[in-house]
């Protein structure tokens, strides 16, 4: 029930919070789910547990996997799962969907972009901000605490914004970056029946057993900010949340982008450690707005 997706880049710091809460005084034990081996608490280790937090300083691709945390309260133990994926650094400027945090919307009056997950880290101001990989310069941009403020927002301010900061742990510094899309609310918008860009209907995707794979559901709904526009994955016609398999998770939040002026929404289904039984499932990409529902189905097949 309590599984949370976390992701990061190799050679950066990644800090993950146990999905089960508890008071700071409660002991939290962390384990590698596959081996049930306890994660050390000594800070000399590259990966170590610190109360409700699991720290990768820095992270490596091989750290990817599911981690179990057990909160030891005075009454009952409570268990959570952190599904961690560490990706290789991208050689080019492009930030793939699976590294994006939830999209934020802004307007002329309110244009705050918060740096995702920063509250988990021990950082000091100022933050560095980049748009589409270019460092932001000029008086319109103000880095304030953990967010960026843009003055006089215009439609071309929409794009992918990356915050970069330094996490300090016992005198050692580690870099962290996080990216999210920013959309600008356009008053002159319109809405239409959803058009699914990906996947193609009845598509088949080849996967390797034991590897991780991502399925992106992407749909466009009209122009400008949309009142109701959602995309989601279903497994065999059921919601992901009703499908109790911690390896298969839909990302929290949805990434909204503008393609040729159209409002498009993506959500990524992350499948860790692909198993044979995953090939038997029907994966439905659903796009829904006030005009109706469209569904595209994709299946997985074993790579020869």
């Amino acid at each position: 029930k309590f599984s949370k997706q976390s992701w990061g880049l190799e050679n950066e710091a990644l800090i993950v919070r146990c999905p089960r809460q508890g008071k700071s005084s409660y002991i939290v034990d962390w384990y590698y789910s596959q081996t049930n081996k306890s994660i050390p608490t000594q800070e000399r280790n590259r990966v170590f547990a610190s109360g409700q937090l699991l720290k990768f300083l820095p992270a490596e691709v091989a750290d990817s996997g599911i981690y179990t945390c057990i909160v030891r309260s005075p009454t009952f133990n409570r268990t959570g799962y952190a599904n961690v994926t560490i990706y290789k650094k991208q050689p080019d400027c492009n930030v793939p969907d699976y590294l994006m945090y939830s999209t934020v919307s802004g307007s002329e009056k309110n244009s705050k972009i918060y740096c995702p997950t920063i509250d988990l880290y021990n950082w000091t101001a100022p933050l560095e901000w980049f748009k589409n990989c270019q460092a932001l310069q000029g008086s319109r941009y103000k880095a304030h605490k953990s967010f960026l403020v843009i003055d006089n927002v215009m439609t071309d301010d929409a794009g992918d914004y990356t915050c970069k900061f330094i996490h300090n742990e016992n005198g050692a510094n580690y870099s962290v970056t996080a990216t999210r899309s920013f959309t600008v609310k356009d008053e002159q918008g319109f809405s239409r029946f959803p058009v699914i860009r990906a996947p193609a209907h009845n598509e088949t995707k080849e996967v390797e057993i034991g590897e991780n794979t991502n399925l992106t559901c992407s749909a466009c709904f009209g122009k400008g900010a949309q009142f109701l526009a959602t995309v989601q994955w279903q497994l065999n016609g059921n919601k992901i949340t009703d499908f109790s398999e911690p390896r298969i998770q839909q990302e929290e939040g949805q990434n909204q982008s503008f393609s040729n002026g159209l409002a498009c929404v993506n959500t990524v289904l992350r499948i860790a450690d692909v198993k044979e039984e995953d090939l038997l499932l029907r994966y439905d990409c659903l796009a829904l707005n006030l005009h109706g529902l469209r569904r595209h189905t994709i299946r997985l097949s074993r790579k020869n």
Epitope: G22, K23, T75, F76, T79
Partner: antibody
Framework: EVQLVQSGAEVKKPGESLKISCKGS????????IGWVRQMPGKGLEWMGI????????RFSPSFQGQVTISADKSITTAYLQWSSLKASDTAMYYC??????????????WGQGTTVTVSS | DIQMTQSPSSLSASVGDRVTITCQAS??????LNWYQQKPGKAPKLLIY???NLETGVPSRFSGSGSGTDFTFTISSLQPEDIATYYC?????????FGGGTKVEIK
């Protein structure tokens, strides 16, 4: 189907002893805490105590400590609540409820149908 | 023992109304709070656990929020079948304790 089935209604006299039961099925009985909750006529819910059938570990509310005994027989997947000497004030509906495993907990997620106990001279 | 104070003790609302019940703990209980529904003559039923998580199969019109000492339970659009008494319950410390209950009736 996960369920807890309780024994039938009881009518007793003050001073008599009583043992009511709660049979679990559809899940691993030894891995979950089972507890008892009292509801007096027209009143709210009161938590009495729990037992972990896997090792018979128990916890009690101070209000019920020494007043009742909670036990379990894992061979027949049944938990018990018993009194050695009933009082009129024990008249109530008694519910058993599942309280999560040794490693995880999500509230009292499965309840028995309740056993009415009436103590009257 | 941790005291749980629930309010109001009873309320009457129309079908479709938004209904809010509050629960206050006598000390910090993190998010270790559950909400139950008890219909007349029936056993209680778990609706929400850990303050805000909807139990499987429970309609989405039920929701919960809060942390620390102050918690809220909401029915976004009251339905005739929601006539019941609702209880909060803390499980941060033994003994587990329930609120006094809120009886919800239809106007």
């Amino acid at each position: 189907e996960v369920q807890l089935v309780q024994s039938g209604a009881e009518v007793k006299k003050p001073g008599e002893s009583l043992k009511i039961s709660c049979k679990g099925s559809g899940y691993s009985f030894t891995n979950y805490w089972i507890g008892w909750v009292r509801q007096m006529p027209g009143k709210g819910l009161e938590w009495m105590g729990i037992i972990y059938p896997g090792n018979s570990d128990t916890r009690f509310s101070p209000s019920f400590q020494g007043q009742v005994t909670i036990s379990a027989d894992k061979s027949i997947t049944t938990a018990y609540l018993q009194w050695s000497s009933l009082k009129a004030s024990d008249t109530a509906m008694y519910y058993c409820a599942r309280h999560g495993t040794s490693s995880d907990y999500y509230g009292l997620d499965v309840w028995g149908q309740g056993t009415t106990v009436t103590v009257s001279s | 023992d941790i005291q749980m104070t629930q309010s109001p003790s009873s309320l009457s609302a129309s079908v479709g109304d938004r209904v809010t019940i509050t629960c206050q703990a006598s000390q910090d209980i993190s998010n270790y709070l559950n909400w139950y529904q008890q219909k007349p003559g029936k056993a209680p039923k778990l609706l929400i656990y850990d303050a805000s998580n909807l139990e499987t199969g429970v309609p989405s019109r039920f929701s919960g929020s809060g942390s620390g000492t102050d918690f809220t339970f909401t029915i976004s659009s009251l339905q005739p079948e929601d006539i019941a008494t609702y209880y909060c319950q803390q499980d941060d410390n033994f003994p587990l304790t329930f609120g006094g209950g809120t009886k919800v009736e239809i106007k």
